[in-house]
């Protein structure tokens, strides 16, 4: 997180740390699902059980955390790893339910009315242990409040080289300051960009940290997030089809996706 | 030639009557007859909220047949009050006996609730009654447990710390 501040206990109780070759993040849904970015878990597709999932802690290196393991990973069938970041969304089913408390609480999915809290200039909050402006991964969970950026303005920002045309799709939303300095960065991938629903007084996930400019927090460039509201049917279908309850059973973790495997691509928010 | 006629013996027999079937408490015999003889039968029907049991074992129906030696081919079952048994534990919740401590028989009421703050009850209001079929049943007719679903979106940033 660029230009952020340290999170306090209970601020982001849905925050999940995903370790598996690289550092990434996710957000707890219900008590046995994690919402994350497809690119953050793609590299572990052959061994989803190798994902080390940690929650209930502020400190990235702390030995005090709640451990969870993956039972199955579901990558959006429209995600293509070497061709942009459209449909950059994935779900991890945990093999056991986690106990909910003040430090581990799921994030809400957006209601139909949620778009009224996600208009241009509305403030969202990104959190993570990714790179800070000092150039290192954060030891303490960091967060930053950033405004939503007009979609056309964001599309225009990413139409000049080195970005291919059409990088920003309708399945993405952008957030950040035109002047730069506040952004998510490498290592924050998969984490939630959350918004406060002022009617219910509950936080919901509006975006998933996906990609951005080569230099995080760059002026005139913005962080790009998967637009979660576009994927509510996809999320709900998977959760209903593959069960709410963690089985707790043995067996190897499954990796589910509806596409052929392609060569891995790297992007600045991957790690 | 004189005709010969053999002996003619007339047999008469009285079938042994079986003992009169006394209905078990909370049950009745059908059909009711003055007496029951060979091949006659009776069935036992229990009142609502009671079930046929032979010892610990449940029966859906019971019919006994009178045998030639004057005994019934099956012993009389009992009509025992339906017992739904201890309710299942509710993950992230608890159960309270409303009718009385540990009472799990017909028409007994229990109340499920979820752990405060972090869980909320889905599916129904958590009130279940022991019905005549032996299942704990919600007011909506569900025999499955309610669900304690985690409350989402709580944060110390809006609740001023916990």
């Amino acid at each position: 997180i660029y230009g952020g501040q340290k999170a306090k206990p209970g601020d982001f109780p849905w925050q999940v740390l995903i370790l598996g070759g690289t550092t990434a993040a996710g957000a707890l849904l219900y008590d046995n699902w994690v919402l994350t970015a497809a690119h953050a878990v793609y590299e572990q597709k052959h061994d989803a059980s190798a994902l080390d999932i940690r929650m209930g802690t502020l400190k990235r290196l702390s030995p005090h955390y709640t451990q969870a393991w993956s039972e199955a990973v579901f990558i959006h069938e429209g995600y293509t790893h070497d061709a942009g970041f459209d449909n950059d969304i994935a779900l991890i089913k945990l093999n056991n339910k986690v106990v909910i408390n003040s430090n581990i609480t799921p994030i809400c999915l957006p209601r139909k009315e949620a778009e009224s809290f996600m208009r241009t200039d509305d403030i969202g909050t990104a959190s993570g242990w990714g790179l800070t402006q000092r150039g290192f991964l954060a030891r303490n969970l960091m967060y930053v409040d950033i405004p939503i950026v007009d979609h056309q303005k964001c599309t225009a920002a990413y139409e000049k080289p080195p970005y291919p045309r059409g990088s920003v799709t309708a399945n993405m939303l952008c957030a950040g300051l035109e002047s730069g300095g506040k952004d998510s960065c490498r290592g924050d991938s998969g984490g939630a960009l959350v918004f406060l629903d002022s009617e219910t007084e509950r936080w919901f996930v509006g975006g998933i940290v996906s990609w951005g400019s080569m230099n995080c927090g760059e002026a005139g460039q913005y962080g790009v997030y998967t637009k979660v509201i576009n994927y509510i049917p996809w999320i709900e279908n998977i959760i209903s089809d593959f069960g709410g309850g963690g089985s707790g059973g043995g067996g190897s973790a499954k990796f589910v996706a509806a596409w052929t495997l392609k060569a891995a691509a790297h992007h600045h928010h991957h790690h | 030639m004189a005709s010969m006629t053999g002996w003619k013996i007339h047999y008469t027999s009285t079938a042994h009557a079986c003992p009169y079937p006394m209905a078990p408490p909370n049950g009745h015999v059908s059909p009711v007859q003055a007496k029951y003889i060979l091949k006659d039968s009776f069935s036992i029907f229990c009142e609502t909220g009671y079930e046929l049991l032979q010892g610990h074992l449940p029966l859906k129906s019971f019919t006994a047949v009178c045998q030639k030696d004057g005994s019934w081919d099956r012993p009389m079952p009992a009509c025992s009050i339906v017992d739904c048994g201890p309710p299942d534990d509710l993950p992230s919740g608890r159960v309270e006996y409303i009718t009385g401590p540990g009472v799990t028989t017909y028409k007994a009421v229990i109340q499920y609730s979820c752990e405060e703050t972090f869980y909320t009850m889905k599916v129904n209001d958590g009130k279940y009654v022991c019905e005549a079929d032996g299942f704990w049943t919600s007011s909506k007719g569900e025999k499955s447990l309610p669900v304690c679903e985690p409350v989402c979106g709580l944060s110390a940033r809006t609740t001023g710390g916990r």
């Epitope: - | 610990h56 074992l57 449940p58 299942f135």
Partner: antibody, heavy 114, light 107 residues
Framework: DVQLQESGPGLVKPSQSLSLTCTVT?????????WNWIRQFPGNKLEWMGY???????SYNPSLKSRISITRNTSTNQFFLQLNSVTTEDTATYFC???????WGQGTTLTVSS | DIVMTQSQKFMSTSVGDRVSVTCKAS??????VAWFQQKPGQSPKPLIY???YRYSGVPDRFTGSGSGTDFTLTISNVQSEDLAEYFC?????????FGAGTKLELN
Amino acid sequence: DVQLQESGPGLVKPSQSLSLTCTVTGYSITSDYAWNWIRQFPGNKLEWMGYISYSGRTSYNPSLKSRISITRNTSTNQFFLQLNSVTTEDTATYFCARYWGDYWGQGTTLTVSS
Amino acid sequence: DIVMTQSQKFMSTSVGDRVSVTCKASQNVGSNVAWFQQKPGQSPKPLIYSASYRYSGVPDRFTGSGSGTDFTLTISNVQSEDLAEYFCHQYNTYPLTFGAGTKLELN
């Protein structure tokens, strides 16, 4: 004629779950009676494990209650035993039986071993 | 749990003899007792239910008696095919329990 037939894996590793099936022919498991699982240990000791009744209600031996589940599939006329976290002590011959106890399956031998 | 005690692990008999296998319940089980016969490699075969009622097809040389806590299976005119292990079983009270068995052997 009523017949019961058990089927299962034969060998299970410790800490795993055991699943057995009892297939009933000649009588519907929803018509009447309690449909039981009974096991016999080496040395011939018999233990009643539990039953599922014609109505679908279950009753379990309290010694097993935390790890046993008996379910049924009425369309295939089968009932099932699941026993979790097995140990070598669960090595036995498993029988399914209709109660009154008048019909028993032939039994299936289960060995728990690593 | 109700304990069903079959005090004799083995009983010796001869073909044509009359033999009585006994079983004692640790508490009152009414008449809710059954008897089973088991031969090696076979499943238990039901003989008697409700203490004294024979299952259909069971020869009438097998007779059950008793109620409350004391039960007896009597085999009159023992045949060679009767050499087997006999188990008593109570189904009056949860959980259902079995006796340890009595093996009938030839003298």
